[in-house]
């Protein structure tokens, strides 16, 4: 109970007849009756509907205060809805009002109207028709009113009725103080309230066992003048290894844990690891799985995936395409990359070396996400193996053996590389004259050079060849006047090399007969 | 002390009337409705109606319509039930009753100790 | 108009035992109902209204309950003063009243 009523009087809890002044006598009348749990209860009720002008009051006891300045008057009343009353529609009435008048000392018998204060007109929240009586859900109103601060030893409360049909069930008085209370895992020790009706007292608590004050957000509450606490401000929070129960923080029990007090509650140690002790902050990964140093405390424990399945190769000369299947086993892990392990291997020793750096990947060595790569530039007629290994991030943390697919193959002979060097030597009006040098890697017999050429304008849409077996070659028949684009490239028996990157090149224009060496009009490095 | 206090027997021929008095002592007569009620001999009570006694408004159950008028003089603290055109099943004691508005419900709760109006040629 | 049937029509009961009325709405009357006694050459007396709730001066060994359509009363310990016609009576819009259970000596 955050707020402590201090009773001063309540009517529900006296069995006797109350024995309040009722004037005129005829006015309000003192009954036994049953609350809406049907227990007996000593109320008061009037119902003088038909006249006019009405005035019955109701007066209690003297009530003494106490050490109370304010003082709260909780009525819990029935109202009879006006409508239900049949030809009463002029005279009846649907509120009460409510007196008080302090003194001293008991003042008798005789109600002094004119000495009481006003404290408000009460007016139910609902009213029932004729068709509710007798239910027990009689629609029991209540209203809480507020007096103070007082002066005087006691005080008197009235009930004025001014032509309404009405049940006085309840007539509580009390004051208010704060209460020891735990909130926000924080204890608020019992607190009186201030005296004034704004006033509000700043309580500082302190953390329950195993809760500790959140970062700079000390727990404090404010103890109202109504004996309520408000505005909690800040809280604690369990400490690591312990989590909220009610108002304390309980351990974490085994095989459960809690990383941080910013955690709510105790997780299940996550898949593969442990925690054999209450009050765990982590759990502990069981042998063969691991963490990685970005994983958080709530994820599983993981182990390096298993090899690839189902390695496949393709040899195109010295090109080989790989390709394999995902591991039958991930470790429980979603960032599976592949890595590429290539070595150049003697038959006659049966040893193997690693591939040096002029070995081509496509699309790269390690951290491949796809399930294939090509690895180009290697040697043609010679012995390699490829390892291609399934690597996530644990596959660092463990001491146990690599697992890996394996394929050894034999290369072929390769298609010469590119030609270099190409040079206009002679450009004129119908024809250009260039020359060029050998590949750097013929990997083989040159056999002849393809020059492919075409017109600028035409985009390679119709393009001509010639073939020659020279490094060097006489281009005629061409357009005056024309930007023409040459590309060259080797033949060997293993196949074509790649095209030479473009040269443009722009034949003489008809109408000058003069001779002189065209300049490239633009030139491309990347081949077709 | 509450009580409502009605005349004596009356005796009265088919076709005549008869005006039974009701007199209130005790409480403030214009705060509480009277209602009327019939018994004939033997048989059970029947609801002939009520009049509010603040306003005079009457109110007449199903069959107590035409021949039956409630009437009031505040001034004696009386109400009266008139009977016109009398007929032999008219032959009945005629109580009239105070009726209680309460929180908690409706009845009569103070009858008068009734009169018995007996038709006969 | 709303017929309100009493059974049974004669109750015979010994001094000191439980009697048991009952009374039946032909519609919902909800709570609005009244008990009354009525002895031989006497008034009637309002002993329960609103279904439940005793009038001034009844002695609690009557009690009564029900809503809606059925409604009983009881009288806990019969006593000799309590030989009586018993009536229930509705008020609705129209006021009507049961025909009555006669408790007897038995």
């Known amino acids: 109970q955050a707020a402590k009523e201090v009773l001063l009087l309540d009517s529900k809890a006296q069995q006797t007849e109350l024995e309040w002044i009722s004037s005129p006598p005829s006015g309000w009348e003192e009954i036994s009756g049953l609350d809406e749990n049907y227990t007996p209860i000593r109320t008061y009720q009037v119902c003088q509907v038909m006249e006019p002008n009405q005035n019955n009051w109701l007066r209690t006891n003297w009530i003494s205060k106490g050490n109370a300045q304010r003082i709260f008057v909780e009525l819990k009343f029935t109202l009879r809805d006006c409508n239900s009353l049949p030809g009463v529609l002029g005279t009846c009435k649907e509120t009460f009002n409510l007196y008080y008048y302090e003194t001293d000392y008991d003042t008798g018998r005789n109600i002094r109207e004119n000495l009481y204060v006003k404290i408000d007109t009460i007016a139910a929240d609902e009213s029932f028709t004729q068709g509710d009586l007798g239910e027990r859900k009689m629609k029991l109103n209540t209203e809480v009113r507020e007096i103070g601060p007082l002066s005087k030893k006691g005080f008197y409360l009235a009930f004025q009725d001014v032509g309404a049909c009405i049940a006085l069930v309840s007539v509580k008085v009390y004051y208010k103080k704060c209460w020891s209370i735990v909130e926000n895992l924080a204890v608020f020790p019992d607190t009186v309230t201030g005296s004034e009706f704004s006033s509000l007292v700043e309580v500082r608590g302190t953390c329950v066992s195993s809760a500790e004050e959140e970062a700079e957000n000390s727990p404090r509450m404010h103890c109202s003048a109504e004996g309520e606490w408000l505005v909690p401000i800040g809280k604690c929070i369990c400490k690591a290894g312990y989590q909220q129960k009610g108002d304390t923080c309980e351990p974490c029990g085994r095989r459960f844990y809690k990383s941080s007090s910013q955690d709510l509650q105790c997780s299940r140690c996550p898949t593969h690891s442990f925690s054999d002790r209450e009050g765990s902050s982590r759990c502990e990964c069981e042998d063969g799985y691991y963490r990685a140093p970005s994983d958080p405390p709530y994820v599983a424990c993981t182990r390096p995936p298993s090899a690839p399945q189902n390695l496949i190769f393709n040899i195109n000369q010295t090109t080989v395409s790989l390709e394999w299947s995902p591991p039958a086993d991930n470790g429980g892990r979603n960032d599976v990359t592949y890595r590429i392990l290539c070595k150049r291997c003697s038959w006659e020793q049966g040893e193997c070396v690693p591939c040096g750096s002029n070995i081509g990947y496509m699309p790269q060595q390690t951290g491949l996400e796809d399930n294939y790569v090509t690895v180009m530039d290697l040697l043609a007629h010679a012995n390699y193996t490829f390892e291609v290994e399934a690597v996530n991030g644990v596959s660092d943390l463990s001491r146990s053996q690599r697992l890996f697919a394996a394929v050894s193959i034999t290369t072929g002979q390769a298609a010469p590389s590119q030609v270099s060097g190409v040079m206009k030597e002679r450009v004129l009006q119908r024809s250009v004259q260039l020359s060029w040098q050998e590949p750097e890697h013929p990997n083989g017999v040159i056999t002849e050079y393809e020059i492919k050429y075409y017109e600028k304008d035409q985009r390679e849409r119709t393009y001509s060849t010639l073939k020659t077996k020279s490094t060097s070659a006489s281009i005629n028949n061409l357009k005056p006047g024309t930007v023409y684009v040459f590309q060259i490239r080797a033949v060997t028996a293993a196949g074509y090399g790649n095209y030479s990157p473009r040269l443009d090149v722009a034949t003489l224009e008809e109408a000058s007969g003069k001779m002189f060496e065209a300049t490239a009009v633009s030139s491309e490095q990347n081949p077709v | 002390q509450v009580q409502l206090l009605q005349s004596g027997a009356e005796v009265k021929k088919p076709g005549a009337s008869v005006k039974v008095p009701c007199k209130a002592s005790?409480?403030?007569?214009?705060?509480?409705?009277m209602s009327w009620v019939r018994q004939a001999p033997g048989q059970g009570l029947e609801w002939m109606g009520w009049?509010?006694?603040?306003?005079?408004?009457?109110t007449y159950a199903q069959g107590f319509t035409g021949r039956f008028v409630f009437s009031l003089d505040t001034s004696v603290s009386t109400a009266y039930l008139q009977i016109s055109s009398l007929k032999a099943e008219d032959t009945a004691v005629y109580y009239c009753a105070r009726v209680r508005f309460t929180v908690y419900g409706d009845g009569m709760d103070v009858w008068g100790q009734g009169t018995l109006v007996t038709v006969s040629s | 108009e709303i017929v309100l049937t009493q059974s049974p029509a004669t109750l015979s009961v010994s001094p000191g035992e439980r009697a048991t009325l009952s009374c039946r709405a032909s519609?919902?009357?909800?709570?609005?109902l009244a008990w009354y006694q009525q002895k031989p050459g006497q008034a009637p007396r309002l002993l329960i209204y609103?279904?439940?709730t005793w009038a001034t001066g009844i002695p609690d060994r009557f009690s009564a309950s029900g809503s809606g359509t059925d409604f009983t009363l009881t009288i806990s310990r019969v006593e000799p003063e309590d030989f009586a016609v018993y009536y229930c009576?509705?008020?609705?819009?129209?006021?009507?009243f049961g025909q009555g259970t006669k408790v007897e000596i038995k």
């Open positions: 009576q509705q008020y609705g819009p129209s006021w009507t």
């Open positions: 009049i509010n006694t603040n306003t005079g408004n009457p």
């Open positions: 609103g279904a439940s």
């Open positions: 519609q919902s009357v909800s709570s609005n």
């Open positions: 005790g409480y403030t007569f214009t705060s509480r409705a």
